[in-house]
C-alpha cells in the first residue's frame, strides 16, 4: 500500500484530506458492493418467494459457491492473515462466474448488477496488491467456467430464480467475513 | 450503466444562487463524493468532496465560502450549493465517487454564469 | 496547492503508434497519481490509478509508470477509439488538482 504523506505544513483555510490507506479503501469497495447486493436482493424478494425459503431448502443445491470454513484462517479463533487473504481473493475469483450470470436477470436493477460485477473486479485488484507476495492464489479455469454458467443459465425458470437468490446471500456472506477478516488485519 | 445523475444546472446571473443535485444509486450510501468541474474548452478543476456521514467536507480554495456540498442519505442524493456566482464559475459540473481517484462519474450537467 | 504539469499538450499520430504522455508534479507525490480519459461531451473514465494500476477492463495497451514527481501514460498501439483527451490527476493532498489534458488527435 502506499505510505501515507505527512502532515502539510502550511495553515490553509479549508482542512486536508489524507488519501485513504489501502485498508479504507478496501474497506470502503466491499461496503460499496454489500450496497449493491442488498439492492439486488431487495428486487429479488419482491419479484419470488425465495427469501422466504427456509435455509435448509436451499441448501440442497449443487452450486458450488465459495464459503468460508475454520480452516480458512479468516474466523476470530485461529486468524490466520496469509491464510486468509489467500482464501478472499480465491473466493472472490471463484465468484466471478456467478456474478456473470447475474448480469442477465434484473430488470429494474440493470446498473446495479453491472456495478456489483465491476466493483468486484476491483476488489480483487485492491486485495491483489495488498497479498503481492502471496503466490497461493489459483484462478479458475475459463473453461470450466464457461460450461458452468451455460449450464446455470439453461435452467428452468424456478431453478434461475433460486440460483440468483442463492448467489445473493452467499456473496453477501462471504463479503460479510471478509469485511472482519480484513479489519483484523 | 448510469449509477449517478446531475440536475439543476442552468443560466444564472453573477452573484446569483444554485443548487445542483446528484441522485446516486443506493451503492453510494457509505462512499465518499466529490464534485469537478470543467470550464467550456478547458480542463478538470476538483470543486471539493464531502464523507459518507456528510461530517467532513473539503473544498478547493477558490470555492471556500462560496460552495457548500451536502448529502441526504435517505434520499441519496449529493448536493451542491453554489452562492455569489461569479463568471469563471461557468462550467459542466460533475459529481463523482472518490476513491482518492474518481472511477464513477455522473453525466454532468451545465451551469452558465451570465447577465 | 500541487501543480501538475502535463506535456504534450496535443499530439498527432495514427492508429497503430506507440505514444507516452508524461505528467510532472511540483513535488514528490509517491504513487498518488491516476489518469482519466474523455471524450467530447463525456464524462472522464478512470483508466490507471497508484500510477500503474490499469483499472479493470481498460484495454492493456495502456500502462502507466513513474512514482514522486515524474509519471506518464503509454498506448502501446493505437486504437481508433483512443483519440480523445487524457489528464493526470494527484490525489497526495488536497486540493486534488489535474493536469491541463494532452489532446490526442488523428494524423
Known amino acids: 500500500a502506499p505510505v501515507p504523506p505527512g502532515e502539510d505544513s502550511k495553515d490553509v483555510a479549508a482542512p486536508h484530506r489524507q488519501p485513504l490507506t489501502s485498508s479504507e479503501r478496501i474497506d470502503k469497495q466491499i461496503r460499496y458492493i454489500l450496497d449493491g447486493i442488498s439492492a439486488l436482493r431487495k428486487e429479488t424478494c419482491n419479484k419470488s418467494n425465495m427469501c422466504e425459503s427456509s435455509k435448509e431448502a436451499l441448501a440442497e443445491n449443487n452450486l458450488n459457491l465459495p464459503k468460508m470454513a475454520e480452516k480458512d484462517g479468516c474466523f476470530q479463533s485461529g486468524f490466520n492473515e496469509e491464510t486468509c487473504l489467500v482464501k478472499i481473493i480465491t473466493g472472490l475469483l471463484e465468484f466471478e462466474v456467478y456474478l456473470e450470470y447475474l448480469q442477465n436477470r434484473f430488470e429494474s436493477s440493470e446498473e446495479q448488477a453491472r456495478a456489483v460485477q465491476m466493483s468486484t473486479k476491483v476488489l480483487i485488484q485492491f486485495l491483489q496488491k495488498k497479498a503481492k507476495n502471496l503466490d497461493a492464489i489459483t484462478t479458475p479455469d475459463p473453461t470450466t467456467n464457461a460450461s458452468l454458467l451455460t449450464k446455470l443459465q439453461a435452467q428452468n425458470q424456478w431453478l434461475q430464480d433460486m440460483t440468483t437468490h442463492l448467489i445473493l446471500r452467499s456473496f453477501k456472506e462471504f463479503l460479510q467475513s471478509s469485511l472482519r477478516a480484513l479489519r483484523q488485519m | 450503466y448510469p449509477q449517478l445523475v446531475e440536475s439543476g444546472g442552468g443560466l444564472v446571473q453573477p452573484g446569483g444562487s444554485l443548487r445542483l443535485s446528484c441522485e446516486a444509486s443506493?451503492?453510494?450510501?457509505?462512499?465518499?463524493m466529490s464534485w469537478v468541474r470543467q470550464a467550456p474548452g478547458k480542463g478538470l478543476e476538483w470543486v471539493g468532496s464531502?464523507?459518507?456521514?456528510?461530517?467532513?467536507?473539503y473544498y478547493n480554495d477558490n470555492v471556500l465560502g462560496r460552495f457548500t456540498i451536502s448529502r441526504d442519505n435517505s434520499k441519496n442524493t449529493l448536493y451542491l450549493q453554489m452562492n455569489s456566482l461569479r463568471a469563471e464559475d461557468t462550467a459542466v459540473y460533475y459529481c463523482?465517487?472518490?476513491?482518492?481517484?474518481?472511477?464513477?462519474w455522473g453525466q454532468g450537467t451545465l451551469v452558465t454564469v451570465s447577465s | 496547492d500541487i501543480q501538475m504539469t502535463q506535456s504534450p499538450s496535443s499530439l498527432s499520430a495514427s492508429v497503430g503508434d506507440r505514444v507516452t504522455i508524461t505528467c510532472r508534479a511540483s513535488?514528490?507525490?509517491?504513487?498518488?497519481l491516476a489518469w482519466y480519459q474523455q471524450k467530447p461531451g463525456k464524462a472522464p473514465k478512470l483508466l490507471i490509478y497508484?500510477?500503474?494500476d490499469r483499472y479493470p477492463e481498460v484495454p492493456s495497451r495502456f500502462s502507466g509508470s513513474g512514482s514522486g514527481t515524474d509519471f506518464t501514460l503509454t498506448i502501446s498501439s493505437l486504437q481508433p477509439e483512443d483519440f480523445a483527451t487524457y489528464y493526470c490527476?494527484?490525489?497526495?493532498?488536497?486540493?486534488?488538482?489535474f493536469g491541463q489534458g494532452t489532446k490526442l488527435e488523428i494524423k
Open positions: 463523482a465517487r472518490d476513491l482518492d481517484f474518481m472511477d464513477e
Open positions: 443506493v451503492l453510494f450510501k457509505h462512499q465518499d
Open positions: 464531502i464523507s459518507p456521514s456528510g461530517g467532513s467536507t
Open positions: 513535488q514528490g507525490i509517491s504513487n498518488y
Open positions: 497508484d500510477g500503474d
Open positions: 490527476q494527484q490525489y497526495y493532498s488536497t486540493p486534488y488538482t
